[in-house]
C-alpha cells in the first residue's frame, strides 16, 4: 500500500491491504477503495477490461474468470492495485488461444494461473512431444509464459501450459504458435526477359517474379520517369512456410512506339527494396540491318580460300537467306546461325566458304535475307589475284616483237636483251607500244596487257626476254636471234617460269 506524504496527493488505499488475494471459486470478492477523490475501479485480464464507478467492487460468486488485476484510480490519476486469484480446481488456466510471435522477438503464451500456489508452471509440447531444445521461456503466474526470442522453426508449434496441482500435472487447452518472419533480406526479384522488341500493335507481356518469406512483400511495376499506374495481374504461391512467390504480369495489349522505354519491377519489405528492369522497344515495322565482317572488296590469291562473313540484325526473325554468284544460288558451302541462343536474340551470322578460288571465280557474291516485313542484301566484290600468264609472244611481219600477258592485278611487261650466250639479260629495252586490251571489259578476272618492241634495233646474236610480272609472280618468254649473213632469224621462242 502507498505511504502518504502530507501536502501532496497520494494514491488511493485498498482494503484488504494486500498486493495479492486468493479467493475460492464461489466465494465473494469484496474490494474497497479508500480515497476522497475516488474515480473508478478497473479490472484487467487477458487484454479485457471492465470498469466500475463505485468505490466498492463486489463479486458475489467468484469465478475463475474473475482472476485478474483490480486497480483503483483517483481524480489525480494516481492508482493502487491488487491482484485477485480465484482458485478453481476445474479451471487452473485462463487462456487466450491466439498465439502469434514475431521472429527474434519474445511472445507471451496467455495462460495466467487461477492458483498461484501450484508448482512447475511451464510449457509442454502437445501429445507428449518434446519442445524444441533451444526454446526458452519465462513463466509469470499473472500474465502467462513468455517464449524468448521466437525462432522461425517454432512456426505451427503445438504446446500447452502446464502446472502441477496437488501432485498431478494439469494441461491448458492447446496453443498453436504462428510465427511472423523477420525480413532479413531484400526481396528476390527477377524478370522473364531483360529486353523486348515488338512491332506496333503486338502485345507486350512481361512477368516479374518476387520471392520472399511472407506474402506481405510489396511489389509493383513502374515505368521509369512516369507516375502512371500500370495494369498488372498477380499469381502467387506458398511453397511451404516462409517461401512465398508472386508473379506480377504487366501487359500492354497493343503496344505503340511511344510505349518504348524501361519498365521497373520494384519490391520492398521492412528490410529494404530491390528492383529489376526490362526494356521495351516498339518499332513501326520490322527491319534488317546487315554488317559485313570483312571488307566488301576482297582480294584473294589464286588457289586460296576466303570466307565471306556477314552479321545481321533481323526483326522479326529471318525467313529466307541465300548467297548468289552470277545469278546462281549456292546450295552448299554456306551456313547461317543465330549469334546467341538467347531468346531475345535478333543478331545472326551468315558465312560463305569459298575454297581454292580460280582466277575465273572472281566477281560479285551477294547475300540476300528477308523476313515478313523487309528484304536486304549486301554484295562482296571478289578479285582473284593471279600470276601473269604469257598468252602470245610473236615476231610480227613488220619486224615487231609482241608479248601478250594476262593476270590480276594488271601485269607489267618489261623487255631485256641478252647479247651472245649470256644468261643474264640486264639491258632493258623500251617498248614501242603498250596496251591494256580488256580495260573496258568485265570488271573481274584477268587483265590482258600487250607490249611490243622493234626487233630491228638488235644487231647481234642474242636473246630477247619478255618479262610479265605483278604482285603475285612473274613469267618470262624468250626470243633467240641468230644472224646468217644479213638475215636475222627468230629461233622458236620459249617461256621460262621464274618464281
Amino acid at each position: 500500500q502507498p505511504s502518504v506524504s502530507p501536502g501532496e496527493p497520494s494514491p488511493p488505499s485498498i482494503h484488504p491491504a494486500k498486493s495479492e488475494l486468493i479467493v475460492r471459486v464461489g466465494n465473494e470478492i469484496r474490494l474497497l477503495c479508500i480515497d476522497p477523490g475516488f474515480v473508478k475501479w478497473t479490472f484487467e485480464i487477458l487484454d479485457e477490461t471492465n470498469e466500475n464507478k463505485q468505490n466498492e467492487w463486489i463479486t458475489e460468486k467468484a469465478e475463475a474468470t474473475n482472476t485478474g488485476k483490480y486497480t483503483c484510480t483517483n481524480k489525480h490519476g494516481l492508482s493502487s492495485s491488487i491482484y485477485v486469484f480465484v482458485r478453481d480446481p476445474a479451471k487452473l488456466f485462463l487462456v487466450d488461444r491466439s498465439l502469434y510471435g514475431k521472429e527474434d522477438n519474445d511472445t507471451l503464451v496467455r495462460c495466467p494461473l487461477t492458483d498461484p500456489e501450484v508448482t512447475s508452471y511451464s510449457l509442454k509440447g502437445c501429445q507428449g512431444k518434446p519442445l524444441p531444445k533451444d526454446l526458452r521461456f519465462v513463466p509469470d503466474p499473472k500474465a502467462g509464459i513468455t517464449i524468448k526470442s521466437v525462432k522461425r522453426a517454432y512456426h505451427r508449434l503445438c504446446l500447452h501450459c502446464s502446472a502441477d496441482q496437488e501432485g498431478k500435472s494439469v494441461l491448458s487447452d492447446k496453443f498453436i504458435l504462428k510465427v511472423r518472419p523477420a525480413f532479413k533480406a531484400v526481396p528476390v526479384v527477377s524478370v522473364s526477359k531483360a529486353s523486348y522488341l515488338l512491332r506496333e500493335g503486338e502485345e507486350f507481356t512481361v512477368t516479374c517474379t518476387i520471392k520472399d518469406v511472407s506474402s506481405s512483400v510489396y511489389s509493383t511495376w513502374k515505368r521509369e520517369n512516369s507516375q502512371t499506374k500500370l495494369q498488372e495481374k498477380y499469381n502467387s504461391w506458398h511453397h511451404g512456410d516462409f517461401n512465398y512467390e508472386r508473379q506480377a504480369t504487366l501487359t500492354i495489349s497493343s503496344a505503340r512506339v511511344n510505349d518504348s522505354g524501361v519498365f521497373m519491377c520494384y519490391a520492398n519489405n521492412t528490410f529494404g527494396s530491390a528492383n529489376v528492369t526490362t526494356t521495351l522497344e516498339v518499332v513501326d515495322k520490322g527491319f534488317i540491318n546487315i554488317f559485313p565482317m570483312i571488307n566488301t572488296t576482297v582480294f584473294v590469291n589464286d588457289g586460296e580460300n576466303v570466307d565471306l562473313i556477314v552479321e545481321y540484325e533481323a526483326f522479326p526473325k529471318p525467313e529466307h537467306q541465300q548467297w548468289i554468284y552470277m545469278n546462281r544460288t549456292f546450295t552448299d558451302k554456306w551456313e547461317d546461325y543465330p549469334k546467341s541462343e538467347n531468346e531475345s536474340n535478333i543478331r545472326y551470322v551468315s558465312e560463305l566458304h569459298l575454297t581454292r578460288l580460280k582466277g575465273t571465280e572472281g566477281g560479285t557474291y551477294t547475300f540476300l535475307v528477308s523476313n515478313s516485313d523487309v528484304n536486304a542484301s549486301i554484295a562482296f566484290n571478289v578479285y582473284v589475284n593471279t600470276k601473269p600468264e604469257i598468252l602470245t609472244y610473236d615476231r610480227l611481219v613488220n619486224g615487231m616483237l609482241q608479248c601478250v600477258a594476262a593476270g590480276f592485278p594488271e601485269p607489267t611487261i618489261d623487255w631485256y636483251f641478252c647479247p651472245g650466250t649470256e644468261q643474264r639479260c640486264s639491258a632493258s629495252v623500251l617498248p614501242v607500244d603498250v596496251q591494256t586490251l580488256n580495260a573496258s571489259g568485265p570488271p573481274f578476272g584477268k587483265l590482258v596487257v600487250q607490249s611490243s618492241i622493234d626487233s630491228s634495233a638488235f644487231k647481234h646474236n642474242g636473246t630477247v626476254e619478255c618479262k610479265a610480272y605483278n604482285d603475285v609472280g612473274k613469267t618470262s618468254a624468250y626470243f633467240n636471234f641468230a644472224f646468217k649473213g644479213n638475215n636475222k632469224e627468230q629461233i622458236h621462242p620459249h617461256t621460262l617460269f621464274t618464281p
Partner: antibody, heavy 119, light 106 residues
Framework: QVQLVQSGAEVKKPGSSVKVSCKAS????????ISWVRQAPGQGLEWMGG????????NYAQKFQGRVTITADESTSTAYMELSSLRSEDTAVYYC????????????WGRGTLVTVSS | DIQMTQSPSSLSASVGDRVTITCRAS??????LNWYQQKPGKAPKLLIY???SLQSGVPSRFSGSGSGTDFTLTISSLQPEDFATYYC????????FGGGTKVEIK
C-alpha cells in the same frame, strides 16, 4: 477471449464507396492477419484481401485489385476495408476474419456487415 | 487461381449417419486446406485446419484427411447441430473457397 467487432450495415448508391471497420478486442492484433471475406446472398465465400498490421502491406485478390483498399490502425486494433465503384453485385455480407495470409486459417470471424448497393 | 471443387453440392442425411464431403483442388496445395461450417445468418466457423488438425473446441466426430489435390471431411455420426453448409478453403495461392456442401435433414 478475442472478438472481432464490425461496423454496422450500410446502404450505398452505385458508383460510391463503402468503408467497413473491424475492431479486435484483446490479443496481439499487430501480428494477426486480418482478411476480408464477402458472401453475396445465397452464394459462397469470396476472399477479397488481407493485411498483417506489423508488415503494413495488404494483399488483394486479383478480382478486387484496384477497387479495394485494406488498412490497419495498430493503435486502435482496427482494420478497415474500403470498396470503391460499387455496383449492385457488390451487395453482400462482408466479414472480417483473423487469418488468411501466409497460409493462416481463418480461426476467428466477425459477425459480418451487410452492404446493400441500390439506386 | 486454384479452383476448389466440392462434392456433393448438397446431401440429405439422418442423425447418426456417417457423412463424407470431398474437396478437389485444381493443382497441388500440399496440406494447406481448411474446413469451415456455416449456419444460416451466422459467420463461418473453423473446424479443421492443415487438412487434418482439429480446431480446439470442435467435437472429435469431425475429421479431415488428404493432401495434394484430394481432401475429405468426415462427420462420423451426424448430430442435429451439424446440419449446415460446409466449405473447404485452400491457402497456397490467392485464397479460394469451394462452392459449399449443404447438409440437410433427410
Amino acid at each position: 477471449q478475442v472478438q472481432l467487432v464490425q461496423s454496422g450495415a450500410e446502404v450505398k448508391k452505385p458508383g460510391s464507396s463503402v468503408k467497413v471497420s473491424c475492431k479486435a478486442s484483446g490479443g496481439t492484433f499487430s501480428s494477426y492477419a486480418i482478411s476480408w471475406v464477402r458472401q453475396a446472398p445465397g452464394q459462397g465465400l469470396e476472399w477479397m484481401g488481407g493485411i498483417i498490421p506489423i508488415f503494413g502491406t495488404a494483399n488483394y485478390a486479383q478480382k478486387f485489385q484496384g477497387r479495394v483498399t485494406i488498412t490497419a490502425d495498430e493503435s486502435t486494433s482496427t482494420a478497415y476495408m474500403e470498396l470503391s465503384s460499387l455496383r449492385s453485385e457488390d451487395t453482400a455480407v462482408y466479414y472480417c476474419a483473423r487469418g488468411g495470409l501466409d497460409t493462416d486459417e481463418f480461426d476467428l470471424w466477425g459477425r459480418g456487415t451487410l452492404v446493400t448497393v441500390s439506386s | 487461381d486454384i479452383q476448389m471443387t466440392q462434392s456433393p453440392s448438397s446431401l440429405s442425411a439422418s442423425v447418426g449417419d456417417r457423412v463424407t464431403i470431398t474437396c478437389r483442388a485444381s493443382q497441388s496445395i500440399n496440406s494447406y486446406l481448411n474446413w469451415y461450417q456455416q449456419k444460416p445468418g451466422k459467420a463461418p466457423k473453423l473446424l479443421i485446419y492443415a487438412a487434418s488438425s482439429l480446431q480446439s473446441g470442435v467435437p472429435s466426430r469431425f475429421s479431415g484427411s488428404g493432401s495434394g489435390t484430394d481432401f475429405t471431411l468426415t462427420i462420423s455420426s451426424l448430430q442435429p447441430e451439424d446440419f449446415a453448409t460446409y466449405y473447404c478453403q485452400q491457402g497456397v495461392s490467392d485464397i479460394t473457397f469451394g462452392g459449399g456442401t449443404k447438409v440437410e435433414i433427410k
